[in-house]
């Protein structure tokens, strides 16, 4: 998880304060007992702040110590601050927990920028606004870190929800969700609705507001509109998927689809941006620039550095194109597309110009480690991580920000041939280097 590029996003109000909620559609899939329906106790259990992550409240130890934990589908360790740090209001105090067990093993996790290190142990863990269960889980007690915790973010740890293959120090350390499923009757599935506010929130607004929902063990009807469309999980390490086509305002980028997945494509709630491989990023920006050519923006804006501001309420959303990613479907030669709006890929930034302005950063950036479908994508959709059936589902989020002219969309089916060829096979020798940092 790399800060600045990973560790996301603004979160916001449950609902679409600047936009419209879409009417429910009736073409629902058949019920799957225990997995679909209402999970009212888990709805609205996420909070967060612009660019700094969505977090859920968890308790650790006996008696329970309450901590806010960042929800990260791009890593696989449950790691919590366990020593004083200037940016932490509270931390896990192992000595106060009667159920803590020391594994007498260290863990060191370097990133491209920054790192954390700690001591491995196990303890009892629960999620107050989650399933009514307690599990014994592996915990990395972070004793030292650099550029990991974020000042004012209000979270004290990270919940890595991906697979054991990318756990540190190695794949023998069982991730939290695996422990949860093994020890309880919770189905092997979770779903995320991340709600971008569409405008920056200050600290007090964040603490009072809702950032979305993490539904553990199921799918909640109220969180999406229309139908869920599923793409296979290509390999169980990250949540890896295959993109088969990319369009900007309906115009095909016309690249070899392998480029879209070079060297992988993942769904990652711990990354703010939509991150694209170098060649794809350059082609996409060229196409977005062309689509919005009635205005010109500074070079640094397209690099995600400079902010562009408009008088409050006058952001010209209409000049910016929609972006569609076509994902491999569950049926041979069938794909579906997810479409995001500029309301997702232009990220509101707070405290920079005057209150008379709305300012934004371009939240699509270049990657050297493949496509990362971060918050920019996820804020448009309700995303179902169906681990049991090795697939990820997308539906239009009931809280996504849009306007009266356009809305995010999930549409299909489309006929796409030779989709398997779109996947990139990472040479075995490269994998160890890939794991040391996510640029």
């Amino acid at each position: 998880t790399q800060h600045g590029i990973r560790l996301p996003l603004r979160s916001g109000l449950g609902g679409a304060p600047l936009g419209l909620r879409l009417p429910r559609e009736t073409d629902e899939e058949p019920e799957e007992p225990g997995r679909r329906g209402s999970f009212v106790e888990m709805v609205d259990n996420l909070r967060g702040k612009s660019g700094q992550g969505y977090y859920v409240e968890m308790t650790v130890g006996s008696p329970p110590q309450t901590l806010n934990i960042l929800v990260d589908t791009g890593s696989s360790n449950f790691a919590v601050g366990a020593a004083p740090h200037p940016f932490l209001h509270r931390y896990y105090q192992r000595q106060l927990s009667s159920t803590y067990r020391d594994l007498r093993k260290g863990v060191y996790v370097p990133y491209t920028q920054g790192k954390w290190e700690g001591e491995l142990g196990t303890d009892l863990v629960s999620i107050p606004h989650g399933p009514n269960v307690t599990v014994r889980a592996n915990i990395a007690a972070i004793t030292e870190s650099d550029k990991f915790f974020i000042n004012g973010s209000n979270w004290e740890g990270i919940l890595g929800l991906a697979y054991a293959e990318i756990a540190r120090p190695d794949d023998s350390l069982e991730p939290f969700f695996d422990s949860l499923v093994k020890q309880t009757h919770v189905p092997n599935l979770f779903s995320l609705q991340l709600c971008g506010a569409g405008f920056p929130l200050n600290q007090s607004e964040v603490l009072a507001s809702v950032g979305g929902s993490m539904i553990i063990g199921g799918i909640d009807h109220s969180l999406y509109t229309g139908s869920l469309w599923y793409t296979p999980i290509r390999r169980e390490w990250y949540y890896e998927v295959i993109i088969v086509r990319v369009e900007i305002n309906g115009q095909d980028l016309k690249m070899d689809c392998k480029e879209y997945n070079y060297d992988k494509s993942i769904v990652d709630s711990g990354t703010t941006n939509l991150r694209l491989p170098k060649k794809v990023f350059e082609a996409a920006v060229k196409s977005i620039k062309a689509a919005s050519s009635t205005e010109k923006f500074p070079d640094g804006f397209w690099l995600g550095e400079q902010l562009v501001c408009w008088q409050a309420g006058t952001t010209p959303w209409n000049i910016f194109p929609v972006i569609s990613l076509y994902l491999m479907g569950e049926v041979t030669n069938q794909s579906f597309r997810i479409t995001i709006l500029p309301q997702q890929y232009l990220r509101p930034v707070e405290d920079v110009a005057t209150s008379q302005d709305d300012c934004y950063k371009f939240a699509i950036s270049q990657s050297s480690t493949g496509t990362v479908m971060g918050a920019v994508i996820m804020e448009g959709f309700y995303v179902v991580f169906d681990r049991a059936r090795k697939r990820i589902g997308f539906a239009v989020s009931a809280c996504h920000v849009h306007d009266e002219f356009r809305t995010a969309a999930v549409e299909g089916p489309f006929v796409t041939l030779d989709m398997e060829d779109c996947g990139y096979n990472i040479p075995q020798t490269d994998e160890s280097t890939l794991m040391t940092g996510r640029a």
Epitope: S293, T294, E295, K296, F297, P298, D299, G300, F301, E305, Q306, L307, V308, C309, D351, V352, A353, C359
Partner: antibody, heavy 120, light 108 residues
Framework: QLQLQESGPGLVKPSETLSLTCTVS??????????WGWIRQPPGKGLEWIGS???????YYNPSLKSRVTISVDTSKNQFSLKLSSVTAADTAVYYC????????????WGRGTLVTVSS | EIVLTQSPATLSLSPGERATLSCRAS??????LAWYQQKPGQAPRLLIY???NRATGIPARFSGSGSGTDFTLTISSLEPEDFAVYYC??????????FGGGTKVEIK
């Protein structure tokens, strides 16, 4: 080489509209690489950005002046213009037109400036 | 709003001396900062952009440094024509809009 020249009345009465034109010579105002801007400087004081325009007509204004400012472009004449309505003595300043270059982030070429006095 | 504060307001130096001018931003502007020189009765002239890049035709004695919130314009050895007012301007927030209050470099 490219040059900018401001023109317009040097004296404007209070409550009236100040109108200035900037003529671009030695190059095209329709270049996609630049915005064009107006900046003013009251006597003995610092610089204040008024607004900027792209050849397509897309405009950005200083929020503090927004309600009174209109900037327009005439590509056929290679000119862009400033109108500032309901002027007061506080609008007395040297008005500069400038090109916004270097990644459209900095004022890399300036006109000589024209002093506009608001007085009855 | 990002505020640029220049110091000192006035710098009294002799030709040949080194001048160090400061510009501090109220919050980070990354490296999106420029320096301008303005002589009496003339328009400003761009000296430095992106914190440290000299504009076309600017002598090597002018150099810029800094990033984030603290920036410095250095004139290694003052020439008689360098006595003027110097302004900084941020472009992190676009369109470029904010200038500092200026530093006057005068002959001692």
């Amino acid at each position: 080489q490219l040059q900018l020249q401001e023109s317009g009345p040097g004296l404007v009465k209070p409550s009236e509209t100040l109108s200035l034109t900037c003529t671009v010579s030695g190059g095209s105002i329709s270049s996609s690489s630049y915005y064009w801007g107006w900046i003013r400087q009251p006597p003995g004081k610092g610089l204040e950005w008024i607004g900027s325009i792209y050849y397509s007509g897309s405009t950005y204004y200083n929020p503090s002046l927004k309600s009174r400012v209109t900037i327009s472009v005439d590509t056929s004449k290679n000119q862009f213009s400033l109108k500032l309505s309901s002027v007061t003595a506080a609008d007395t300043a040297v008005y500069y037109c400038a090109r916004v270059g270097h990644g459209i982030s900095y004022f890399d070429l300036w006109g000589r400036g024209t002093l506009v006095t608001v007085s009855s | 709003e990002i505020v640029l504060t220049q110091s000192p307001a006035t710098l009294s130096l002799s030709p040949g001396e080194r001048a160090t001018l400061s510009c501090r931003a109220s919050q980070s502007v990354s490296s999106y900062l420029a320096w301008y020189q303005q002589k009496p009765g003339q328009a400003p002239r761009l000296l430095i952009y992106d914190a440290s890049n000299r504009a076309t035709g600017i002598p090597a004695r002018f150099s810029g440094s800094g990033s984030g919130t603290d920036f410095t314009l250095t004139i290694s050895s003052l020439e008689p024509e360098d006595f003027a007012v110097y302004y900084c301007q941020q472009a992190y927030v676009w369109p470029p809009r904010t200038f500092g209050g200026g530093t006057k470099v005068e002959i001692k």
